[in-house]
Interface confidence: low
């Protein structure tokens, strides 16, 4: 069960990061730190980096409240799993400030696009029987 | 308006096949995760089937899994079911349901449901 | 697979009563629930999503209660447009289901 709450909660991850994509003239024009090409192992330390990043609505037109009920969830911690816990205490994945910063259509471009990487990866531990909840 | 137009339901036979459509309209088809419900006449609603927004998450009910496939065209703003070998306790009204997104868990808009019977 | 189980199967009360129907999870599934109400012939209807938050368009005489095992679907004074079916959804886990329903009646 925990397998499965933690897949629909990245599932609902990406969801959200195409949602908010619809609303980029919405956000606040800043540049933000955005993971691109993540090695191996670092996929959690760059997710966290992605949910640190001060994405904030540019509290314009009706959409604001939305936005940031969608971003505020998108700092919501996922379920943890072995992957999480092994990669939490891995101290050679690059700081958040060393990578590339980004607006927001690129910010969250790269966000889908990691999360696109850690689902697949789930699915085939999954399937592979190497992680459990 | 948001809305959900579901086609292609019919008589069939058992064994038979069907292929289900939904046509969304008045939201971002792209973003948002589809899934079929049904109805057997006179029971409870059943959940049969969920697509994610990029089609990356699939899963079905067992009592459909092997049988029947989902997909989505993005491009075209449909919903697909395709449903083989059919029985006759997949008689129901079929739903094409949106999932509420934004992280959010309920399902918002509802088709007005396509009749499948499948019968000798 | 998470069983939800939905009691009472129905129920008879008058306009004006005070409702509560109660979904109950097989196992903890946190606020992962959706409540639907459904009448003859139509589509069923979002009531409450995340277990307790109204959907937008929902009259506030509907509230929705609980989390982990335990949920409650409150109508606080009937009206007679509420009579129908009541369904609750879990979303914890695949597969999705759905209590059997509770069917409200006029007395």
């Known amino acids: 069960q925990g397998q499965d709450r933690h897949m629909i909660r990245m599932r609902q991850l990406i969801d959200i990061v195409d949602q908010l994509k619809n609303y980029v003239n919405d956000l606040v024009p800043e540049f933000l730190p955005a993971p691109e090409d993540v090695e191996t192992n670092c996929e959690w330390s760059a997710f966290s980096c992605f949910q640190k990043a001060q994405l904030k609505s540019a509290n314009t037109g009706n959409n604001e409240r939305i936005i940031n009920v969608s971003i505020k969830k998108l700092k919501r911690k996922p379920p943890s799993t072995n992957a999480g816990r092994r990669q939490k205490h891995r101290l050679t994945c690059p700081s958040c400030d060393s990578y590339e910063k980004k607006p927001p259509k690129e910010f969250l471009e790269r966000f889908k696009s990691l999360l696109d990487k850690m689902d697949h990866q789930h699915l085939s531990s999954r399937t592979h029987g190497s992680e459990d909840s | 308006e948001v809305q959900l137009v579901e086609s292609g339901g019919g008589l069939v036979k058992p064994g038979g096949s069907l292929r289900l459509s939904c046509a969304a309209s008045g939201f971002i088809f792209s973003s948002y995760s589809m899934n079929w419900v049904r109805q057997a006449p006179g029971k409870g609603l059943e959940w049969v089937s969920s697509?994610?927004?990029?089609?990356?998450?699939?899963h079905y009910a067992d009592s459909v899994k092997g049988r029947f496939t989902i997909s989505r065209d993005n491009a075209k703003n449909s919903l697909y079911l395709q449903m083989n070998s059919l029985r006759a306790e997949d008689t129901a009204v079929y739903y094409c349901v949106r999932e509420r997104g934004w992280g959010y868990y309920g399902m918002d808009v509802w088709g007005q449901g396509t009749t499948v019977t499948v019968s000798s | 697979a998470i069983q939800l189980t939905q009691s009472p199967s129905s129920l008879s009360a008058s306009v004006g009563d005070r409702v509560t129907i109660t979904c109950r999870a097989s196992q903890d599934i946190d606020s992962a629930l959706a409540w639907y109400q459904q009448k003859p012939g139509k589509a069923p209807k979002i009531l409450i999503h995340d277990a307790s938050s109204l959907e937008s368009g929902v009259p506030s005489r509907f509230s929705g209660s609980g989390s982990g095992t335990d949920f409650t679907l409150t109508i606080s004074s009937l009206q007679p447009e509420d009579f129908a079916t009541y369904y609750c959804?879990?979303?914890?886990?695949?597969?999705?289901?759905f209590g059997q329903g509770t069917k409200l009646e006029i007395k």
């Open positions: 959804q879990q979303f914890n886990s695949y597969p999705y289901t």
């Open positions: 697509i994610t927004s990029g089609s990356y998450y699939i």
